[in-house]
């Protein structure tokens, strides 16, 4: 295989040898080992796991394995002063209180240090007032409430169901609406699949189960006290009042048993339509306040959590490249969990562990990759992607010059139906070619390729005979590498057949019931889906690190740029009068995309024909491929989001989990009809078209012949 030529290794040490070394039984064993106690960021238990992983990666054969520590802002409940929500009567007596903890799952009753459900980084406070039900607390839900229903959330406590969008966006929206507190709950409509039992008898969420999670709006900043710079020993830290992304109102999560008690008394307006109704036996009235008999009762929140600067530890392993040691392919996933981390993150960490073991086995037999592979076990992902972001901030100069690709490795499964891939268009062909070579683990696809089962179960909406590959959003550790630094990135996992519930997660997400047994009994008893994900993630890393010519196809970027330009033009044309009045032209953008397409096509022709035995020319062509993603970075960043610098992709301003294309133009156009100064608003649209067109043209020119 050509990918072996430059490293002078025996033919058996190819991709097949690497893949054959991966074993489902090992992944299972590692998952068990990583999930027996909680590994909350900033705790001694998670530090001990970091040291264990360091030791084992060294044993597996990596050249070096180091801990990289940072002192970052984390958030914990007060151990002696628990958080809860009450219904109070007119005398102020608490007539109902929400539960203080989740009932522990069987076998875990005596485990200590299970953090009770809380919303990380909630400020302290004891607000009381009338309740307003705000559906998913999305931008459009508040538009419906405020504009159509004329319901004012100012001074109210809002209750929102989890799902559809990142919880931090819900809190931000509630704050902007003037709410003084937020209650988040899991509705069975979103977290209880019909026909499946609750844990421990199935994979559904029981009524006492609660989703933990941070509620920050960091927009890529990392540690809230040291935006842009590593939280090291000599860091200058902002005061808490100047910290990035902290919520300003108390927030607390509850399960659906407790939610029932709050929602069943709701009065006021009826839900506007059926999309506001969940599956509880309650009216889903919007409020404000309780119905007739209970109208004098109020809701009171009791939040006493504290923000604390705490030490976190990343584990960074290095397998030095034989030919291009100054080119880095990174495989990273987090280690910290909310409780046991049965799926998130340890189903991913176990896969990384097995990938490291396989690479180490090959290295012990005399093999080395062409390029350096870095392996990372990130800390404090659950608290805002802190470990990965601080490390990238500390190493940004190296990464921007040497970073070839980043492959993310959080949860390996969120279901067991089919593959799900989000990545840069540069990796489309790599993913297609790799999955054609891997066996499908799916029932009914014995002897068929992963590509075939994936394409059948998750077809591309645009191209027949191809699988769906999604845009990268955020909410995971690739964010700093892709959105800030412009390093080609991708992620892969097994997912559910639940397209309408795309961003709600699996039912037991971030609950105490996310255990080893959940995975072993209900999701993947044979660990065959984990093995497939290991093959995809590991195979991508292998090819990226070992192929002589980088496995990036710039023509696929041209195709999507055209699609995204068409889409944003169509959105803008929904305002034809303003387009005409303010002379808004997309000509420059379409021209730039046309030029990109032509230059990418010519580059691809040269890539087929050049002399691969000439190391200087080879390096030159590879550098053009490596730096293409970097060329989409605007050093000034997006408006009000300086750490989101990619002009083609950014996390949606309305849902951190989702990716938006041409985000600068999209945000400038969003709700433009409501802007008080239309001339200024359309001026910003024109500016964003200019920035996008310039960036696409500039990126195209990086692919031109160098002289």
């Amino acid at each position: 295989k050509s990918s072996n030529e430059a490293t002078n290794i025996t033919p058996k040490h190819n991709m097949k040898a690497f893949l054959d070394e991966l074993k489902a039984e090992n992944i299972k064993k590692f998952l068990y080992n990583f999930t027996q106690i909680p590994h909350l960021a900033g705790t001694e238990q998670n530090f001990q796991l970091a040291k264990q992983i360091q030791s084992q990666w060294k044993e597996f054969g990596l050249d070096s394995v180091e801990l990289a520590h940072y002192d970052v802002l984390l958030s914990y409940p007060n151990k002696t002063h628990p958080n809860y929500i009450s219904i109070i009567n007119e005398d102020g007596n608490e007539i109902f209180n929400t539960s203080l903890f989740e009932p522990p799952p069987p076998g875990y009753e005596n485990v200590s240090d299970i953090v009770p459900p809380f919303s990380a980084f909630s400020p302290q406070g004891m607000p009381e007032g009338d309740l307003v039900y705000v559906n998913y607390a999305r931008t459009e839900d508040f538009f419906k409430l405020e504009r159509d229903m004329k319901i004012n959330c100012s001074g109210k406590i809002v209750i929102a169901r989890y799902g559809k969008v990142f919880r931090g966006n819900k809190v931000k929206n509630a704050q902007l609406a003037g709410a003084k507190g937020v209650i988040l709950y899991s509705d069975p409509a979103d977290y209880f699949a019909p026909g499946v039992k609750s844990y421990p008898d199935g994979w559904n969420l029981p009524g006492g189960g609660v989703q933990r999670g941070n509620i920050l709006n960091l927009n890529g900043a990392g540690d809230p006290l040291t935006p842009g710079y590593p939280a090291n020993e000599y860091a200058y830290r902002r005061g808490i009042a100047e910290a990035v992304g902290l919520p300003s109102i108390p927030v607390h999560p509850i399960g659906y048993y407790d939610a029932q008690k709050l929602l069943e008394k709701m009065g006021g307006s009826a839900p506007p339509d059926s999309s506001w109704r969940g599956s509880l036996k309650v009216p889903y009235n919007v409020g404000p306040g309780f119905t007739g008999n209970f109208s004098t009762q109020k809701v009171k929140m009791h939040i006493h959590s504290t923000n604390e600067v705490t030490r976190i530890y990343n584990v960074i392993g290095t397998l030095r490249g034989a030919v291009e040691p100054d080119r880095y392919v990174i495989l990273g996933g987090h280690r910290d969990s909310w409780v046991f981390g049965g799926i998130d993150p340890q189903s991913g960490a176990a896969v990384v562990h097995e990938i490291v073991r396989s690479f180490g086995t090959l290295k012990k037999e005399g093999w080395r990759p062409r390029r350096t592979i870095l392996f990372a076990s990130w800390d404090a992902e659950e608290f805002g992607l802190l470990g990965s972001t601080e490390w990238a901030e500390e190493n940004s100069r190296l990464l921007q010059e040497r970073g070839v690709a980043y492959i993310n490795a959080d949860s390996s499964i969120e279901g067991n139906y089919t593959l799900r891939v989000d990545c840069t268009p540069l990796m489309y062909s790599l993913v297609h070619n790799l999955t054609k070579e891997l066996k499908s683990p799916d029932e009914g696809f014995e002897g068929k390729s992963l590509y075939e089962s994936w394409t059948k179960k998750s077809p591309s909406p645009e191209f027949s005979g191809m699988p769906r590959i999604s845009k990268l959003g955020s909410g995971n550790d690739f964010e700093v590498f892709f959105q800030r630094l412009g390093i080609a990135s991708g992620r892969a996992r097994y997912t559910k057949n639940w397209e309408t519930n795309k961003f709600s997660g699996y039912p037991l997400y971030h609950s105490v019931y996310e255990t080893y047994e959940l995975v072993e009994k209900f999701y993947d008893p044979m660990f065959k889906y984990h093995l497939t994900v290991a093959q995809v993630r590991g195979g991508m890393v292998f090819e990226l690190a070992n192929s002589i010519v980088l496995p990036f196809d710039c023509r696929d970027y041209a195709v999507v740029l055209r699609k995204y330009a068409d889409k944003i033009y169509s959105i803008s044309m929904k305002h034809p009068q303003e387009m005409k009045t303010y002379s808004v032209s997309f000509d420059s953008l379409f021209s730039a995309v046309k030029n990109f397409t032509e230059i990418a096509s010519k580059f691809s022709e040269r890539l087929q024909d050049f002399d691969k035995s000439n190391p200087i020319v080879l390096r030159m062509m590879n550098d053009q491929l490596m730096f293409l993603e970097r060329a989409f970075i605007d050093p000034l960043g997006l408006p009000d989001r300086p750490f989101y610098r990619h002009v083609i992709y950014a996390p949606s301003s309305h849902n951190k989990y989702a990716g938006e294309s041409f985000p600068g133009i999209y945000d400038a156009l969003f709700d433009i009809e409501s802007k008080v100064d239309p001339s200024k608003a359309w001026g910003e649209v024109k500016r964003q078209i200019y920035v996008a067109a310039f960036t696409v043209q500039a990126a195209a020119e990086t692919l031109s012949e160098v002289a």
């Epitope: 330009a565 000509d587 021209s591």
Partner: nanobody
Framework: EVQLLESGGGLVQPGGSLRLSCAAS????????LSWVRQAPGKGLEWVSS????????DYADAVKGRFTISRDNSKNTLYLQMNSLRVEDTAVYYC??????WGQGTLVTVSS
């Protein structure tokens, strides 16, 4: 010089059909998304539909969804709008638009019994 020339308008009864065409010249036709926009008598401009480089990427205003079909023939540098089940409220001058600033002269569609 960019030129967009619409044709195919006329008088039609409610429930009838028309097919509008827009012949384009002076630019690389296949490189641009295109739109139809209309203006009813005494009203402002209203977006109708847009199409990307091929017939797979299309978008419609709610008022016309299911009745109108936008398409293009890149080999003929022509944009089309097939209008079925026409209603009185579809009466308007229909414009072909490239990139937001280049507009045709328009073709009048009158739906009346």
């Amino acid at each position: 010089e960019v030129q967009l020339l619409e044709s195919g308008g006329g008088l039609v009864q409610p429930g009838g059909s028309l097919r509008l065409s827009c012949a384009a010249s002076g630019f690389s036709f296949s490189s641009y998304a295109l739109s139809w926009v209309r203006q009813a008598p005494g009203k402002g401009l209203e977006w109708v539909s847009s199409i990307g480089e091929n017939n797979a990427t299309t978008d419609y205003a709610d008022a016309v969804k299911g009745r109108f079909t936008i398409s293009r023939d890149n080999s003929k540098n022509t944009l089309y709008l097939q209008m079925n089940s026409l209603r009185v409220e579809d009466t308007a001058v229909y414009y072909c638009v490239k990139d937001g600033v280049h507009w045709g002269q328009g073709t009048l569609v009158t739906v009346s019994s």
